[in-house]
């Protein structure tokens, strides 16, 4: 029985040329996370975080995507084409697969300065990862 839930950063906005952190967190389950896949709106994979082997950044994004913090992903040098949906897929044992959605809107710099951000940081739980210990999670 799948009891877990995925919490994500939800709808977020960021400036063109800037960077943004995509973050998902699996809670309410004791299932073991074996792998997290990060996908873009067109279903192309950005990155894999395998629990045993670590990170793999797909070649098309190697210059613009940085692993972490935690199981999240940092997308850099944003372009207008980066606007759209992003998905985190958690492969777990024994539960199976959980999927979370984030919508990123990339704004022209001038617009971004006068626009209210979608994301409202709220104090969240700390969680542990093999690579990065105790990263604050915003949801």
């Amino acid at each position: 029985m799948m009891t877990g839930t995925i919490e994500t950063t939800g709808n977020i906005s960021a400036k063109k040329g800037g960077s943004v952190i995509l973050q998902c967190h699996l809670s309410s389950t004791m299932a073991q996370v074996t792998q997290v896949n990060w996908e873009q709106h067109d279903h192309s994979l950005l990155a894999i975080r395998n629990a045993e082997l670590g990170w793999h950044i797909y070649p098309a994004f190697k210059d613009r995507v940085a692993p972490g913090p935690g199981l999240g992903l940092t997308l850099q040098s944003l372009t207008m084409n980066d606007t759209g949906e992003y998905f985190c897929t958690y492969h777990t044992y024994p539960d199976g697969t959980y999927r979370g959605r984030i919508f990123l809107e990339v704004l022209e710099s001038s617009v971004a300065e006068h626009s209210a951000r979608f994301q409202i940081p709220i104090e969240g739980r700390d969680y542990k990862d093999d690579d990065d210990k105790h990263h604050h999670h915003h949801h």
Epitope: T34, L53, G54, Y58
Partner: antibody, heavy 121, light 106 residues
Framework: EVQLVESGGGLVKPGGSLRLSCAAS????????MSWVRQAPGKGLEWVGR??????????DYAAPVKGRFTISRDDSKNTLYLQMNSLKTEDTAVYYC????????????WGQGTLVTVSS | SYELTQPPSVSVSPGQTASITCSGD??????ACWYQQKPGQSPVLVIY???KRPSGIPERFSGSNSGNTATLTISGTQAMDEADYYC?????????FGGGTKLTVL
């Protein structure tokens, strides 16, 4: 220690079939993307195809010369990779290697010794 | 279909720097890998993901990849480095090898 051992090669007539196996050990096989690469006598390396891990869909990709004739599969419970070769041609004669795709820093293991497939009448 | 072009042969004196190039359309958007193969032996991965060295590969081997060209550089080349070298373009949908370069240490 990461180890890959290919087997199943041999002499087969044009139009025939053969199934190659690759026994993997020393790593968690189910995590790996695996490829088959071949090398004709005195020639260079040629990628045959690959199979992704189940957590990446377990999908397969093939090089144009073998598409529709060769099928790659895996049995994670047996730590074994397979290459089913049908409608073999003389130009398929080569040493066949199974390899680990270099996705991860800690899993870039050595190649096996390969297995020779000879297609001749 | 995607193609990679390597020079058939490169010569270098011991102790000097050898550079082997590999060219392909927008190769910089893919990962470049390099394999070393000595006569009668299986290939050995010497560079992966453009510039990373697997454990056990000497520091004199380095790689770069941008634009349409990937380069394998061997600094302080030794006689034992004489071999065939193959570049490989790797992405999530396909893999392609170059034709190979025979490195001769004079």
């Amino acid at each position: 220690e990461v180890q890959l051992v290919e087997s199943g090669g041999g002499l087969v007539k044009p139009g025939g079939s053969l199934r190659l196996s690759c026994a993997a050990s020393g790593f968690t096989f189910s995590n790996a993307w695996m490829s088959w690469v071949r090398q004709a006598p005195g020639k260079g390396l040629e990628w045959v195809g690959r199979i992704k891990s189940k957590t990446n869909g377990g999908t397969t990709d093939y090089a144009a010369p073998v598409k529709g004739r060769f099928t790659i599969s895996r049995d994670d419970s047996k730590n074994t990779l397979y290459l089913q070769m049908n409608s073999l041609k003389t130009e398929d004669t080569a040493v066949y290697y199974c390899t680990i795709d270099p996705l991860y820093d800690i899993l870039t293991g050595p190649w096996g010794q390969g297995t020779l497939v000879t297609v001749s009448s | 279909s995607y193609e990679l072009t390597q020079p058939p042969s490169v010569s270098v004196s011991p102790g000097q720097t050898a550079s082997i190039t590999c060219s392909g359309d927008k190769l910089g958007d893919k990962y470049a890998c390099w394999y070393q193969q000595k006569p009668g032996q299986s290939p050995v991965l010497v560079i992966y993901q453009d510039s990373k060295r697997p454990s056990g590969i000497p520091e004199r081997f380095s790689g770069s990849n941008s634009g349409n060209t990937a380069t394998l550089t061997i600094s302080g080349t030794q006689a034992m480095d004489e071999a065939d070298y193959y570049c490989q373009a790797w992405d999530s949908s396909t893999v392609v090898f170059g034709g190979g370069t025979k490195l001769t240490v004079l």
